[in-house]
């Protein structure tokens, strides 16, 4: 906490610029206008403040905003944005994509901090759900975000939105979260055609139940191997040598390489020893 | 509910062979979904699977130790059976038989039997 | 072999703390990775299974994450009951393995 002093004579701040620099902490608290910084905020990031006089701008708008920041100041926080904390940002009401835009570039390059998750939890919350837009830009900046989503968070995602999501979007999601967003994926891209189709849905069908692999495999999809080993277990041990055969098709020799692994292993185990014969590709069931 | 009950001699000389059955209550070892594991533990020690099996015959075994592991099904008694061929003083651990839920994972152990391999 | 490191072997926590204790497998297991909690004379109890589902009955301080190599086991308030053994387990492959084991001791 700085101490509250006088300001001396001629330094009185008249606009935020470069001068500023040379200011001593209990000058900057003595002499720049809380008001005159939050109107002039854009160009704070212009100037190269230390740390610790950062610390003093951040004083002086905690003590003009008692109840939080108004979107105004948010918006040009800039690198001001890492002296927050969750708690400061708690108290803030975001509703501009841009703004959150303008927050999340300060953050650019770096893992998710508490700050940013906070950010984007309220952004979230704001608006009652994850829309399009805001899902594009936040997997943008992280492409992990969606799976970073409880199941619950997952169930406000509407349908539209997916189609702003990637299949890196969906490397680190388990299957609860897959479980959510399948039923989504299918609605949206419920009107492509076959092949179409299959493309978008395909990094989504790690929560698909059998009766949807089972059509999939009257439709010469080719799934790929990658693709299969992400199938949930009950959704593959119901299904025919026969319908694995259709669902894979030119891939279907990928099965020996993946035998001792899960759901493959899960799957031959409980197939009979004729059936899986007729592959020709010696597994043991 | 099921539960799961190991039985067989506690101690064992060394180079003779280890004999241990598990026996299936409430429930069928014949389970379409479910495969029945061997764990053992040594005295202060860790958890190390030995292998599994399924009521059709197959099994799996612990790369480590399946020149000597046998595991077997008894549909007719609903039970699994374990057999380590030559023993030695490092096979002396708590044996443990259990069910693994494709779906989940090991959810029903027994509550486990010390065999010692002593002379 | 696929390998499964856990992280601590030992902590020593209070009632009321979070604890988290992380599991690495040596290749991908996808999410089939198991947590079990065993007390002294006891058979291990399933915690998790399939990396963040919550086995039936078991408390919902209780929580997993990850998927690939990288997996946690969090109690997000310790209690009485939770001063146990730790094991994690990968069922991916057909060797099925367990980590080493953390043991949650009381500060």
């Known amino acids: 906490e700085v101490e509250k002093t006088a300001c001396p004579s001629g330094k009185k701040a008249r606009e935020i610029d470069e001068s500023l620099i040379f200011y001593k902490k209990w000058e900057l608290e003595a002499c720049v206008d809380a008001a005159l910084l939050a109107t002039q905020m854009d160009r704070v990031n212009a100037i190269p403040f230390t740390y610790e006089q950062l610390d003093v701008l951040k004083h002086k708008l905690d003590e003009l905003y008692p109840q939080g920041y108004p979107e105004s100041v948010i918006q040009h926080l800039g690198y001001l944005f890492l002296k927050m904390s969750p708690e400061d940002i708690r108290k803030w009401n975001v509703t501009s994509l841009e703004t959150l835009k303008a927050l999340l570039e300060v953050n650019k390059g770096h893992e998710m901090s508490p700050q940013v998750a906070t950010l984007i939890d309220r952004f979230v919350k704001g608006r009652g759900q994850l829309d399009k837009d805001t899902l594009d830009t936040l997997t943008a900046f992280y492409p992990g975000y969606l799976c970073s989503l409880s199941p619950e968070e997952l169930s406000s995602v509407p349908p539209s939105s997916i189609w702003a999501v990637r299949p890196q979007d969906l490397d680190t999601c388990d299957p609860r979260q897959l479980d959510v967003l399948y039923p989504k994926a299918r609605l949206a891209f419920q009107n492509m055609n076959g092949s179409e189709y299959f493309v978008k849905i395909q990094s989504f069908l790690g929560g698909a139940p059998t009766e949807d692999l089972k059509a999939l495999s009257q439709q010469n999809v080719s799934m790929d191997l990658a693709t299969f080993m992400k199938l949930r277990t009950d959704a593959v041990l119901p299904l025919t040598v026969a319908e694995v055969q259709k669902l894979l098709g030119p891939h279907v020799e990928g099965l020996k390489a993946e035998e001792r692994h899960r759901p493959v292993r899960d799957w031959i185990l409980r197939q009979r020893q004729d059936d899986l014969d007729t592959l020709g590709l010696g597994l043991q069931g | 509910q099921v539960q799961l009950q190991e039985s067989g001699p506690g101690l064992v000389k060394p180079s003779e062979t280890l004999s241990l059955t598990c026996t299936v209550s409430?429930?069928?070892?014949?389970?379409?979904?479910?495969?029945w594991s061997w764990i053992r533990q040594p005295p202060g020690k860790g958890l190390e699977w030995i292998g599994y099996?399924?009521?059709?015959?197959?099994?799996n075994y612990n790369p480590s130790l399946k020149s000597r592991v046998t595991i077997s099904v008894d549909t007719s008694k609903n039970q699994f059976s374990l057999k380590l061929s030559s023993v030695t003083a490092a096979d002396t651990a708590v044996y443990y038989c259990?069910?693994?839920?494709?779906?989940?994972?090991?959810?029903?152990w027994g509550q486990g039997t010390m065999v010692t391999v002593s002379s | 072999d696929i390998q499964m490191t856990q992280s601590p072997s030992s902590l020593s926590a209070s009632v009321g703390d979070r604890v988290t204790i992380t599991c690495r497998a040596s290749?991908?297991?996808?999410?089939?990775l198991n947590w079990y909690q065993q007390k002294p004379g006891k058979a291990p109890k399933l915690l998790i299974y399939?990396?963040?589902s919550l086995q039936s009955g078991v408390p919902s301080r209780f929580s997993g994450s990850g998927s690939g190599t990288d997996f946690t086991l969090t109690i997000s308030s310790l209690q009485p009951e939770d001063f146990a053994t730790y094991y994690c387990?990968?069922?991916?492959?057909?060797?099925?393995?367990f980590g080493g084991g953390t043991k949650v001791e009381i500060k």
């Open positions: 399939a990396a963040s």
């Open positions: 099996i399924y009521y059709s015959g197959s099994t």
């Open positions: 409430g429930g069928s070892v014949s389970s379409y979904h479910d495969l």
């Open positions: 387990q990968q069922s991916y492959d057909a060797s099925y393995t």
């Open positions: 290749q991908s297991i996808s999410s089939y």
């Open positions: 259990a069910r693994e839920d494709a779906l989940t994972g090991f959810d029903i």
